[in-house]
Interface confidence: low
């Protein structure tokens, strides 16, 4: 599923991401834009053999199990396939664990490079939330 900007903002808000660990909703929408272009089916292979999955490009080395990543920790205790669902519940729940891990949203390279320090509220402007 490819979400619309406001559609995703509403879904993320429903799942409790607005101001989760101090990060406003705009941060999460911005991260999703530059990680996956709002596509729940996005996958990208990394040079270490791990793969990033879903709308927030969650990594199989640490967070989910795809049966394909040697030494995977599966800290979110989910199959990576769950992160590709059009229902973003699994991605949101895992993202909450990631953002609580100490580095906050710096865990997402795209957020660090494209969203951090910018006007992230622009990503939810005009949305009926």
């Amino acid at each position: 599923k490819v979400f619309g900007r406001c559609e995703l903002a509403a879904a993320m808000k429903r799942h409790g991401l607005d101001n989760y660990r101090g990060y406003s909703l705009g941060n999460w929408v911005c991260a999703a834009k530059f990680e996956s272009n709002f596509n729940t089916q996005a996958t990208n292979r990394n040079t270490d053999g791990s793969t990033d999955y879903g709308i927030l490009q969650i990594n199989s080395r640490w967070w989910c199990n795809d049966g394909r990543t040697p030494g995977s920790r599966n800290l979110c205790n989910i199959p990576c396939s769950a992160l590709l669902s059009s229902d973003i519940t699994a991605s949101v729940n895992c993202a909450k664990k990631i953002v609580s891990d100490g580095n906050g949203m710096n865990a997402w390279v795209a957020w660090r490079n494209r969203c951090k320090g910018t006007d992230v509220q622009a990503w939810i402007r005009g949305c009926r939330l």
Partner: antibody, heavy 115, light 107 residues
Framework: QVQLQESGAEVMKPGASVKISCKAT????????IEWVKQRPGHGLEWIGE????????YYNEKFKGKATFTADTSSNTAYMQLSSLTSEDSAVYYC?????????WGQGTTLTVS | DIELTQSPATLSVTPGDSVSLSCRAS??????LHWYQQKPHESPRLLIK???QSMSGIPSRFSGSGSGTDFTLSINSVETEDFGMYFC?????????FGGGTKLEIK
Amino acid sequence: QVQLQESGAEVMKPGASVKISCKATGYTFTTYWIEWVKQRPGHGLEWIGEILPGSGSTYYNEKFKGKATFTADTSSNTAYMQLSSLTSEDSAVYYCARGDGYYGYWGQGTTLTVS
Amino acid sequence: DIELTQSPATLSVTPGDSVSLSCRASQSISNNLHWYQQKPHESPRLLIKYTSQSMSGIPSRFSGSGSGTDFTLSINSVETEDFGMYFCQQSNSWPRTFGGGTKLEIK
């Protein structure tokens, strides 16, 4: 329940191409890798490669690059493998399987004869 | 590529015997090793995933053990329906590879 239904046996001439299909039912087709495996008597099982239908991502065994091409049609929950420039070495049973690192579900196999 | 060597190539047993099938990897694959059974003209069937995790519906007489490079599939008190080919497969790296198989036959 999860099922993978492959297309029927094929007899092809050397140099031709063939397209084998694998229809998936009983699970969310877009979110699991479909693997392709070759089996020839005396040669055991060989992994050809895999496709993730939802994104179209593909990974091939180097040995089969240029020989096999994977596609998937998410509207019909069907994965395809095309084999080109066929030779007698391509005569084998070809399986699709659902990939989770391990292969818990397999198609019934498609027998390809090149002669 | 990781090479998997299965031994013996053929194992002749009497129903009721207990047997062990070996799979040796050319380099360490942690526990990323899976076992399949295949009968003539049938597709492979997954018995054990990740070295020792039994699949649902698989009889309890099948068990797996090992780690690193040496792995074993054990069948406690073989039954007639157990005869066929057994393959191991690694998912530690690409390309995925299979062992050459062990044929379990009736003595």
